[in-house]
């Protein structure tokens, strides 16, 4: 199995561009979570997904940030436009 | 019938603290971003701070970050700010509302705080 | 901080009347989110996502706007509807309110 995979690993970009996320969970899994982390504020969970329902996006309440999730083997996280303060590391996990 | 109690509010010296409770009903209060708002006598609302469900993440309006502090009890059905170094410009109605539909869809009825020696 | 700014302050009105409240944003915002105050209570949602009505809310309220402008407009006023209203922004933390529009009975 070749577990989550994400897109891009990296990217840069200028305040105010649109940055867009990709996410591909574990096949059979159900269950998917975006978190953000960063020194200061640690680890952060934005949103998360069961059976493509958003079930708890309270991690993002900025209308910056949204999330759709259109099947069952792929996830999008969007910030638009974007901050500098949203520089960070982004995860995307699955679960059974 | 979703509700939010507010209470802790009353009459304090300046420097003094408060610690402001809000107690929800009626929704599962776990699947829930919270907002604490004021607004001081006469004037229009203010945003004071907003913590996510699981309390992963907060934010606080710039004036009042070091001062005060949300938190949320998840298994009392209980929203928190603790209030310290108050000063008289915090005298104000402090409200708690729910975030939903992007927004706050639901407000608590408020409590007082009165700052003055 | 993205400071709103609400026009007019101020608004003498008739029943029947339509009213427009303009919500304009010192930077861009994605949405826009409206609330109506009586005096002595709490804010109540009007409108969220700058066009949606929320449960409950009369069809003669209504919201339009994009970029940096923003209108609230009552098609026909009620009694009920004489009360301040207040525009809000989630697009960045600080989350900002405008000053507010206060709708009296002309």
């Known amino acids: 199995d070749a577990g989550v995979i994400q897109s891009p690993r990296h990217e840069v970009t200028e305040m105010g561009q649109e940055v867009t996320l990709r996410c591909k969970p574990i096949s059979g899994h159900n269950s998917l979570f975006w978190y953000r982390q960063t020194m200061m504020r640690g680890l952060e969970l934005l949103i998360y997904f069961n059976n493509n329902v958003p079930i708890d996006d309270s991690g993002m309440p900025e209308d910056r940030f949204s999330a759709k999730m259109p099947n069952a083997s792929f996830s999008t996280l969007k910030i638009q436009p974007s901050e500098p303060r949203d520089s960070a590391v982004y995860f995307c996990a699955s679960s059974l | 019938e979703v509700q939010l109690v507010e209470s802790g509010g009353g009459l304090v010296q300046p420097g003094g603290s408060l610690r402001l409770s809000c107690a929800a009903s009626g929704f599962t209060f776990s699947n829930f971003g919270m907002h604490w708002v004021r607004q001081a006598p006469g004037k229009g609302l203010e945003w004071v701070s907003y913590?996510?469900?699981?309390?992963?993440?907060?934010y606080y309006a710039d004036t009042l970050k070091g001062r005060f502090t949300i938190s949320r009890d998840n298994s009392k059905n209980t929203l928190y700010l603790q209030m310290n170094s108050l000063r008289a410009e915090d005298t104000a109605v402090y409200y708690c509302?729910?975030?939903?539909?992007?927004?706050?869809?639901?407000w608590g009825q408020g409590t007082t705080v009165t700052v003055s020696s | 901080d993205n400071q709103l700014t609400q026009s007019p302050s101020f608004l003498s009105a008739s029943v029947g009347d339509r009213v427009t409240i303009t919500c304009r944003a010192s930077?861009?915002?994605?949405?826009i989110y409206w609330y109506q105050q009586k005096p002595g209570k709490a804010p109540k949602l009007l409108i969220y996502y700058t066009s949606n009505l929320a449960p409950g809310v009369p069809s003669r309220f209504s919201g339009s706007g994009s970029g940096n402008e923003y209108t609230l407009t009552i098609s026909s006023l009620q009694p009920e509807d004489f009360a301040t209203y207040y525009c809000e922004q989630f697009t960045s933390s600080p989350f900002t309110f405008g000053q507010g529009t206060k709708l009296e009975i002309k």
């Open positions: 509302a729910r975030r939903g539909e992007g927004a706050m869809d639901y």
């Open positions: 913590i996510s469900s699981g309390s992963s993440t907060i």
């Open positions: 930077s861009s915002v994605n949405y």
